[in-house]
């Protein structure tokens, strides 16, 4: 499988919220055996490779924002800890899954990494992230709501978020 | 903060069995692996094998299949590795150690010395 | 089984020196993780992902390498890093360690 990022940039005026979103792509096992532990973290555009180095997000690290589940369920965090920093990340039935920020700082300006590890009978791992920029404004030159690019791969016509 | 803490040191005899306990606290105990290592003395270390308490889930080195039983109580968050048939060769300081899918043993306990000796 | 070959097994360095460790999978490996063990103590994540410093650590450390061959240096050796650097890889069960390397003081 792989990982897709809709969005490969988000511009967002101070104070709105943003959905940073990845997507699994591929077949997906749904085993018994296969479990899925999906999180997300800033970093850097390393030389070597993008999303090497493991950040935290707003204090909180890639391991307080985990997400661990089997292949068929849906999950979302419901940490205290998470909510407090204005955080959620959630994962669905099809794939997707998301970190929201809420009300933007420009402290928030950089780049995130989706991370997903498939697990199969605890002792065989699959890694693979997706990396995305987020832009925070303000001033007069700031969106009045976040603004999104569609990567490369898709549409290049950029699409305002609802 | 993270922690780690493990039952006290054990003598036993060869043939015996022994149950080491690891009690942690201070993050989401189903959110990681938990893993044991051994050092034998003077030597290098050894994975054990490692138990999710997500699920339960197990997986362990061939060499201690059969003979090392990894077990956790979710309601206490403590991880236990249960050692049988011992011999002289399995004293060592055991060690519990989390790790979170996809990168590395972050945090460890601060072992157990186990002796076999008749 | 892969097999990890930490060389060499010891060095004996002064306080300042440059030194470099290397350790060789038999087959290839995605990613090297380093810890440092002192006498009497557990062992301490150094380096994950073959090249990023884990929480607290000395930016004097860093790490290198890819598929087989990977590399740990200490820029400037000081008197706390004398330890045993223990190599590791999750790449394919079951997961193992190299030998180690002691670093002591010459």
């Known amino acids: 499988f792989k990982v897709a990022t809709p969005y490969s940039l988000y511009v967002c005026p101070e104070g709105q919220n943003v959905t940073l979103t990845c997507r699994l792509l591929g077949p997906v096992d749904k085993g018994h055996d296969v479990t899925f532990y999906k999180t997300w973290y800033r970093s850097s555009r390393g030389e070597v490779q993008t999303c090497s180095e493991r950040r935290p997000i707003r204090n909180l690290t890639f391991q307080d924002l985990h997400l661990h589940h089997g292949g068929h369920q849906a999950a979302n965090t419901s940490h205290d800890l998470a909510q407090r920093h204005g955080l959620e990340s959630a994962s669905d039935h099809h794939g997707n899954f998301s970190i929201t920020m809420r009300n933007l700082t420009l402290l928030d300006s950089g780049l995130y990494c989706c991370l997903v590890v498939e697990i199969r009978h605890h002792h065989s791992e699959h890694r693979v992230h997706g990396a995305m920029e987020l832009q925070v404004q303000t001033g007069k030159d700031a969106p009045s709501n976040c603004v999104v690019y569609p990567s490369s791969s898709q549409d290049s016509e950029n699409i305002t978020a609802a | 903060q993270v922690q780690l803490v493990q039952s006290g040191a054990e003598v036993k005899k060869p043939g015996a069995s022994v149950k080491i306990s690891c009690k942690a606290s201070?993050?989401?105990?189903?959110?990681?692996?938990m893993n044991w290592v051994r050092q034998a003395p003077g030597q290098g270390l050894e994975w054990i094998g490692l138990?999710?308490?997500?699920?339960?889930?197990?997986s362990y080195a061939q060499k201690f299949q059969g003979r090392a039983t990894l077990t956790v109580d979710t309601s206490t968050s403590t991880a236990y590795m249960e050692l049988s048939s011992l011999r002289s060769e399995d004293t060592a300081v055991y060690y519990c150690?989390?790790?979170?899918?996809?990168?590395?043993?972050?945090?460890w306990g601060q072992g157990t010395l186990v002796t076999v000796s008749s | 089984e892969i097999v990890l070959t930490q060389s060499p097994a010891t060095l004996s360095l002064s306080p300042g020196e440059r030194v470099t460790m290397s350790c060789s999978a038999s087959?290839?490996?995605?990613?090297m993780y380093w810890y440092q063990q002192k006498p009497g103590q557990a062992p301490r994540l150094l380096i994950y992902?073959?090249?990023n410093l884990a929480s607290g650590v000395p930016a004097r450390f860093s790490g290198s390498g890819s598929g087989t061959d990977y590399t740990l240096t200490i820029s400037s050796m000081e008197p706390e890093d004398f330890a045993v650097y223990y190599c590791?890889?999750?790449?394919?069960?079951?997961?193992?360690f190299g030998q180690g390397t002691k670093l002591e003081i010459k």
């Open positions: 150690a989390r790790r979170a899918y996809g990168y590395a043993m972050d945090y």
């Open positions: 201070g993050f989401s105990f189903t959110g990681y692996t």
């Open positions: 138990i999710s308490p997500y699920d339960g889930g197990t």
């Open positions: 087959s290839s490996v995605s990613y």
């Open positions: 992902d073959t090249s």
């Open positions: 590791q890889q999750w790449s394919s069960y079951p997961f193992t």
